[in-house]
Every structure is written in C-alpha cells, then in structure tokens.
C-alpha cells in the first residue's frame, strides 16, 4: 500500500530536504524558511534566496516551512484553570499547564482542564498525582472510595457498590440494632 500524499507533500518530495518546489515553476527548488519566519516571496530562480520574514508579535512558526502566514499564538484557557508555563516566541507556541498539585483532564485532544490532586484524606496514596492523572487513593478500614475520595462507611447505602467494602461495618450496625430489640 502506498501512503496517500497531499498535493503539497507530493510537490515537496521532488525537492531535496529543506527545499520546496516553486508553485509557479516546478523545475525550481526554493529553500524553506527557518522556524520563526514565514514565506514572503518565493525564490526568483535556482540558487537564489527565498524571501523570508520574521513572524510578528503574537505569531510563530515552530519548524522550517513555506507558510504564507505565521501561526497565531495559543492563549491559555483561564476558564479551564490553565496557567502560562512559557510565553509565545517567534519560533515556539505558548506552553500552557496547571498549577502545582493539579493535574490535567483532557476533554478533547487539545483541550484540558486543571483539577486539584486528591489528598487521600482517610486513606493512603497508592499512586502519586501525575501531570495527566489524579492521585490514586487506597482507603482506610471503615471508608470506601467514591469519586476518588475516601467516604465513611456510615454513608454507604445497601444499594450501592460500597456494600462489599463496608460489609463488616454494615453487619456491625445491623447487629447493634438487632441487639437493642427484645
């Protein structure tokens, strides 16, 4: 199977690495622009320079290219709790992340929200909080895990899955109730 190539990839593959085929004259290979710059004018002929210009503030190109425009810098989503790790430069997009003791939950491939790492109160840390994963907690006896928090077995209703984990406690409660009747 031959991988499908787009028109631009097909044209670029004719030229050596670091060059691209002139859009109006396929016998000319022009040098690509360095990262941090964009294509202002194609090279006029073989061995002649491509006219590349530096990206303006608020835009960037992160790799060698023959783009007619620089890419707009990303903005960190404050409403998602994101903070700026490093600001945009002409050759690198903004890097967004979360604060200390927070992790990322990805709603989609590129959109994440910051959440506080669980502290495992009434339990112990089984796996530490990671950049993209919350702490994994193990609960102490008399507690069960609900939404990654250790909750007292006194909050366990018989219909819930916690009954297995809290079975001794439930039996004890039942036993003390029964012992009170004569």
């Amino acid at each position: 199977l031959v991988p499908h190539l787009g028109d631009r990839e097909k044209r670029d593959s004719v030229c050596p690495q670091g060059k691209y085929i002139h859009p109006q004259n396929n016998s000319i290979c022009c040098t690509k622009c360095h990262k941090g710059t964009y294509l202002y004018n194609d090279c006029p002929g073989p061995g002649q320079d491509t006219d590349c210009r530096e990206c303006e503030s608020g835009s960037f190109t992160a790799s060698e290219n023959h783009l007619r425009h620089c890419l707009s810098c990303s903005k960190c989503r404050k409403e998602m709790g994101q903070v700026e790790i490093s600001s945009c430069t002409v050759d690198r997009d903004t890097v967004c992340g979360c604060r200390k003791n927070q992790y990322r939950h990805y709603w989609s491939e590129n959109l994440f929200q910051c959440f506080n790492c669980s502290l495992c109160l009434n339990g112990t840390v089984h796996l530490s909080c990671q950049e993209k994963q919350n702490t994994v907690c193990t609960c102490h006896a008399g507690f069960f895990l609900r939404e990654n928090e250790c909750v007292s077995c006194s909050n366990c209703k018989k219909s819930l899955e916690c009954t297995k984990l809290c079975l001794p406690q439930i039996e004890n409660v039942k036993g003390t109730e029964d012992s009170g009747t004569t």
């Epitope: 939950h105 709603w107 989609s108 491939e109 590129n110 959440f115 990654n148």
Partner: nanobody, 122 residues
Framework: EVQLLESGGGLVQPGGSLRLSCAAS????????MGWVRQAPGKGLEWVSW????????YYADSVKGRFTISRDNSKNTLYLQMNSLRAEDTAVYYC???????????????WGQGTLVTVSS
C-alpha cells in the same frame, strides 16, 4: 434515535432552588460527556456546565460556579442540574446536550432536547 427529555423547570423566587433532570435514550449514555446549555430571552446560547463520563470531572461557567451542581446517574441514563441561589439573570430555557468534542476547541453539542423554561422572578 437519540432522545433527550428535560424536566424540572418552572417559576421560582430569587434565592430559590430547582433541580433539572434530563432522561437520555437511543445511545450509550456512559460513552458521552453530557452538558447543560441555556438561552436567555433575546440572547445567544451559553454553556452552563458539563460532566465527564466518570461523573467526577466537571466544568462550570463562571456565572454559575458555586451555585449550580451538575451530576449524572449512569445506571438511570439521567443527567441532573441542581440550581441553588437562583438569580433573575438565570432566567432562560435550559437544554440538555450530548457533547461531541472537536480536537481543538470547546465541545459541540450534536444532540439536545426541547428545553425546559426556568423563570426566576418575585
């Protein structure tokens, strides 16, 4: 066929509470993020809140943070919105939405219900 049926709307005084429900059918509820969108009279659609499949991860618009709580019961295929400390500006038609994420931006809702009207007035 995907169906989303909202209920629980009505007239409530400022400071009051309401609980909206949304019964979902026609698709695997446990595979999708669900959300609430609202439309105030004469205004555009506004995201209120959404909730991940796990029921833990939630998003709230700044305008409702601390007052509204979204939840879901995957065993009942039902989405909820508990609305407390209601204000006049919360008056709107509230729509339940099944979310279909794009790779780069906020979610798009590919299905939504007929809506339930919430009126906050004294």
């Amino acid at each position: 066929e995907v169906q989303l049926l909202e209920s629980g709307g009505g007239l409530v005084q400022p400071g009051g509470s309401l609980r909206l429900s949304c019964a979902a059918s026609g698709y695997t509820f446990t595979e999708y993020t669900m959300g609430w969108v609202r439309q105030a009279p004469g205004k555009g659609l506004e995201w209120v809140s959404w909730i991940a499949v796990d029921g833990i991860h939630t998003y709230y618009a700044d305008s409702v943070k601390g007052r509204f709580t979204i939840s879901r019961d995957n065993s009942k295929n039902t989405l909820y919105l508990q609305m407390n400390s209601l204000r006049a500006e919360d008056t709107a038609v509230y729509y339940c939405a099944k979310l279909d994420w794009t790779a780069t931006d906020f979610s798009i809702f590919d299905y939504w219900g007929q809506g339930t009207l919430v009126t906050v007035s004294s």
